[in-house]
């Protein structure tokens, strides 16, 4: 039985040209995390495999950095980066857990005055 839950940063906003940390945390399970996939809609951004390490998709190599931890840092944000992001935790023996984050990339002035939650 899958008892774990994924906590995420939820809905976040960031400035165009800036960077943001996408973070998920798996709790309430003793299952072993074997791999975490980060996806944007249907596009694979990165994989962190417990045995092999990080793989960053070639098309995102210049703008994506691993960490902190199992999280992902997106850099040089553009308005096109707005959308849903998913952290997919592959665990043993539980199976797969998925978390969702919605990122909105805003023009600088809008982001500065917006009331949305922002990762420092």
């Amino acid at each position: 039985m899958m008892t774990g839950t994924i906590e995420t940063t939820g809905n976040i906003s960031a400035e165009k040209g800036g960077s943001i940390i996408l973070q998920c945390h798996l709790s309430s399970t003793t299952a072993q995390v074997t791999q975490v996939n980060w996806e944007q809609q249907d596009q694979l951004l990165a994989i962190c495999n417990a045995d092999l390490g990080w793989h960053i998709s070639p098309s995102f190599k210049d703008r994506v950095a691993p960490g902190p931890g199992l999280g992902l840092t997106l850099q040089s944000l553009t308005v096109n980066d707005t959308g849903e992001y998913f952290c997919i935790y592959h665990t043993y023996p539980d199976g797969t857990y998925t978390g969702r984050i919605f990122l909105e990339v805003l023009e600088s002035s809008v982001a500065e005055h917006g009331a949305r939650f922002q990762i420092p």
Epitope: T34, D51, L52, G53
Partner: antibody, heavy 119, light 107 residues
């Protein structure tokens, strides 16, 4: 005794194929990721490929991507490296190796099998 | 890919000397760094993993330190059996990569 024994090396012409095998004993093979590392004569070490315990994730060096395929058969305690479209620069001693659990440091190595690509 | 730059490429030392080898990564690799010793005609031997953890059976005169991009392997008092080539290896990013090696020779 924990042991890895490679086989399948030899002299092969450029463009041809070769399949290396690595027989494991003395540990629970199916619990570990496994790797291939090579060393050209008189040169340093080069990581070639790695595969997770269940073959769910695989990685390759850029120099072999698209030409080499790593695989394993846990029932036979064996690791394989299928090498296609071989080039002179693939000439090397090929080692298979197992990692320390959760560390990614390679603590057990075979004796190596020599692959020579030449016409 | 991550480049690992080892220095020096070779070092001449005497028995009893303290020897320090450095390994610099082109990007941060946390603590996912290992050190190996290789003697001619032999397979590499793991000395240090996780940047600073001593592999079982390895003498305590070997030690590793560092995180991020800068790492060090230290042999506190060189012994005759320590004359060999030493390699660092990162396992944070795929593909894994090795440094170019440091040859420790007898002075």
């Amino acid at each position: 005794e924990v042991q890895l024994v490679e086989s399948g090396g030899g002299l092969v012409q450029p463009g041809r194929s070769l399949r290396l095998s690595c027989a494991a004993s003395g540990f629970t093979f199916g619990d570990y990721a496994m790797h291939w590392v090579r060393q050209a004569p008189g040169k340093g070490l080069e990581w070639v490929s790695g595969i997770t315990w269940n073959s769910g994730s695989i990685g390759y060096a850029d120099s072999v991507k698209g030409r080499f395929t790593i695989s394993r058969d846990n029932a036979k305690n064996s690791l394989y490296l299928q090498m296609n479209s071989l080039r002179a620069e693939d000439t090397a001693l090929y080692y298979c190796a197992k990692p320390v659990p959760k560390s990614r440091g390679l603590d057990v190595w075979g004796q190596g099998t020599m692959v020579t690509v030449s016409s | 890919d991550i480049q690992l730059t080892q220095s020096p490429s070779s070092v001449s030392a005497s028995v009893g000397d303290r020897v320090t080898i450095t390994c610099r990564a082109s990007q941060g690799i946390s603590s996912w760094l290992a050190w190996y010793q290789q003697k001619p005609g032999k397979a590499p031997k793991l000395l240090i993993y996780g940047a600073s953890s001593l592999q079982s059976g390895v003498p305590s005169r070997f030690s590793g330190s560092g995180s991020g991009t800068d790492f060090t392997l230290t042999i506190s008092s060189l012994q005759p059996e320590d004359f060999a080539t030493y390699y660092c290896q990162q396992a944070f990013y795929l593909p894994w990569t090795f440094g170019g090696g440091t040859k420790v020779e007898i002075k």
